[in-house]
Interface confidence: medium
Amino acid sequence: EAYKSEIAHRYNDLGEEHFRGLVLVAFSQYLQQCPFEDHVKLAKEVTEFAKACAAEESGANCDKSLHTLFGDKLCTVASLRDKYGDMADCCEKQEPDRNECFLAHKDDNPGFPPLVAPEPDALCAAFQDNEQLFLGKYLYEIARRHPYFYAPELLYYAQQYKGVFAECCQAADKAACLGPKIEALREKVLLSSAKERFKCASLQKFGDRAFKAWSVARLSQRFPKADFAEISKVVTDLTKVHKECCHGDLLECADDRADLAKYMCENQDSISTKLKECCDKPVLEKSQCLAEVERDELPGDLPSLAADFVEDKEVCKNYQEAKDVFLGTFLYEYARRHPEYSVSLLLRLAKEYEATLEKCCATDDPPTCYAKVLDEFKPLVDEPQNLVKTNCELFEKLGEYGFQNALLVRYTKKAPQVSTPTLVEVSRKLGKVGTKCCKKPESERMSCAEDFLSVVLNRLCVLHEKTPVSERVTKCCSESLVNRRPCFSGLEVDETYVPKEFNAETFTFHADLCTLPEAEKQVKKQTALVELLKHKPKATDEQLKTVMGDFGAFVEKCCAAENKEGCFSEEGPKLVAAAQAALV
């Protein structure tokens, strides 16, 4: 159906509240440095304009594309040149180049300070004073820090955020109520951001085919009763939704996501028995619920895979006539039978199957050539299984902080050229895989761990792409999406690395360290560990353990001292000298 006015169409479909929220998110993701008040003003103006177009579709400018309308609005920002430098040059381009230009300037690491919540009383006062403004500020702060955040999901989290305040601001102990709830929400939001960034990277760097393959595997595991045609339909629609959101087309994305939820609920009988509860909810909760829905039970009568993919005499004909459909069917069948495998592993198996058919279908006797193809999957399956087993054992022995430190050492040795903040951030996140996955039953561990690692390693790739410093990181990031994790796991110590010059400033600590929250204290210590390794890359684990133990004792001692600052300035240099001597 063609609409005279695209903006009116989206306004009518989404409703004023969601429309305004999405416009605010879009602007905040594009112009990350602008103050909140500016974005509120822009979003208000665009919403008023959309409302006018909804009332009169043939009004002035109502027929313009959303990119044109949004881009024109962004280009009215007076401080564009001062705040964003060459991003202002985007405004000299025509659509669609102008939007592509804005997208290219999105900053994955804008360097804003972490969000610190004011006192609960002040927060509750702000919430009760102007709920809409309060939630708008939440959308803005998340969106500017996470320029690829999945916008309709952010609206859902804002709704959750609102619910937390509605409940806790009535509580006797507001702080006790808010603290754990806000922290739990924060964890979900950070994971959601990283997952969507991974999806956008899949689409942008590896194309629709990679994203579709990933989605076929994931949805086939989740909906094993659905047939391939149904899975394909959902995957096609889902790909469109994520392409739109990753491309900054947030109104279309949210609208199409709602349509997909509607479709899934109307056809739940042929998708999954688990959708019923989700489908009774309002649109934001419905979509979120569908995205997180538990796996359906496997149908009981699944025939052997070999019948169709090995024993059938027409395997090569099927493969050569329509490769993607045939491989898609293979991936679907393998995934629905193996909910315990990670998506990455399933995609590696499909790739191996494809390579075998490429080779065998060119021979005189293809059936003999590919007869053992399913047996050849064993090493590919064993590798992540062993990796998870080994690392979970290490996690159980060391705890989260110790496990993070072990990973920090491992990854600094693999890629010492990478910036210290990036190594610390990524290793801390990699370390969380233990907490997140190692306590799960055996049947869920690999899927949990490897797919989480893929998301975290994508963060490393995204940050590294901004300032590339290591050829081996570039290679692992760009060669194959499904083999990123094995590629990083396989990296040995970088023997070409020239140790960093010693800089005493890096190892100088002050009394402010004592008042930091525990997590920030850990980051300081882990930063010192990385710097130490960059200075002495040949240090053994034992040496590092000793030095870090001494460092911990030094911090504890000085933080307990009368004259903290004096202790740090006196004991610090001694510690550094001892560490240098120990690491010779």
């Epitope: 659905a226 047939d227 391939f228 045609a229 149904e230 899975i231 394909s232 339909k233 042929s270 025939p303 019948a307 169709d308 059938d312 005499k313 027409e314 004909k317 099927n318 006539e321 329509a322 459909v325 045939f326 069917t329 679907y332």
Partner: nanobody, 126 residues
Framework: EVQLLESGGGLVQPGGSLRLSCAAS????????VAWFRQAPGKEREFVAG????????YYADSVKGRFTISRDNSKNTLYLQMNSLRPEDTAVYYC???????????????????WGQGTLVTVSS
């Protein structure tokens, strides 16, 4: 749930022709592998012809190659089997079978097809 309904069978003289139809009630029949099987009295059910979904790849049993043609009309959700140069040994009940979720793989193994029509009888006799 997939429902299949065959029609078009009957009595025909050797050398004659018949066109069998199979109407399907399934949203994605155009993306589904469908096939014709037949069963002569006292014999095993055997594969006759198949067609892939999405891309129309066709498959035939050696005994019918060059005489039978399988086709589909997606707008009508119907599968056809055009049978020419019929022989007495073609006498059988002809069944339409579908494998949703298997767009390309038109297997010759009857057990792999979950959905079947009730069959239509073809008799070739003078």
């Amino acid at each position: 749930e997939v429902q299949l309904l065959e029609s078009g069978g009957g009595l025909v003289q050797p050398g004659g022709s018949l066109r069998l139809s199979c109407a399907a009630s399934y949203r994605y029949i155009d993306e589904t592998a469908v096939a014709w099987f037949r069963q002569a009295p006292g014999k095993e059910r055997e594969f006759v012809a198949g067609i892939g979904g999405g891309v129309d790849i066709t498959y035939y049993a050696d005994s019918v190659k060059g005489r039978f043609t399988i086709s589909r009309d997606n707008s009508k959700n119907t599968l056809y089997l055009q049978m020419n140069s019929l022989r007495p040994e073609d006498t059988a009940v002809y069944y339409c079978a579908a494998r949703p979720g298997r767009p390309l793989i038109t297997s010759k193994v009857a057990d792999l097809y979950p959905y079947w029509g009730q069959g239509t009888l073809v008799t070739v006799s003078s």
